[in-house]
Amino acid sequence: TSHLVKCAEKEKTFCVNGGECFMVKDLSNPSRYLCKCQPGFTGARCTENVPMKVQNQEKAEELYQK
């Protein structure tokens, strides 16, 4: 089974635009990294800007779900 741990200090630059880095701990596979992006960013490394229109739409959906 795999679980997520926060990246070590030296690995944090895997993610950009303020994204938070996590390492997938999996005994059967080499280390993989995942990014939790800041609002307004997306992509495997948080490299892409989310257009404002989409951001607003996501916020509206979030409020609706609440």
């Epitope: 030296k10 690995e11 944090k12 630059t13 895997f14 635009n17 303020g18 495997a44 490299t47």
Partner: antibody
Amino acid sequence: EVQLVESGGGLVQPGGSLRLSCAASGFTFSGTWIHWVRQAPGKGLEWVAAITPADGSTNYADSVKGRFTISADTSKNTAYLQMNSLRAEDTAVYYCATYMFAMDYWGQGTLVTVSS
Amino acid sequence: DIQMTQSPSSLSASVGDRVTITCRASQDVSTAVAWYQQKPGKAPKLLIYSASFLYSGVPSRFSGSGSGTDFTLTISSLQPEDFATYYCQQSYWMPPTFGQGTKVEIK
């Protein structure tokens, strides 16, 4: 052993096009981030574009946006930089580099000269 | 875009000298700064990543420090092969940006 080999540079007239290739070996291509960085003669390093082969995310410097296109073929472990509407100020050595936590491996570079 | 301002732009030093190069970011870049060495006609080589971590195979006389906006590359005892140009680069924010370079020359 990790290797990056650029090709496709040469002399081109202003307004012309070139396609640069960056052939990679010795690492998992789809798990990295590929960047193109250029260096004009006697000048410093300037970031040009990047692609994340895993999800196809692309980014461009403002100076090349709309003129250059970065792409990757994971089956060939090769990244490309399609350069259109070339200008004299695009004259430079173009390097590709892999990025894990920084730009850790670099190719030898390929010279692009834009001149009439 | 984030501006990375390196100083000095050039310096003259002797073998055995301690050399310090600084880099200032125009806004907070956390510890997402790398340092590269480039020799004429060659591709840059990574020395330091994440501000203070020595890249594999790089001699221990190279060290990096800093966080936020102020960063330093130190060569504790300059060797003949260290005469080159050094660049800092931030990768906290897109686009990645480089400093203008510091040329280390023989005194």
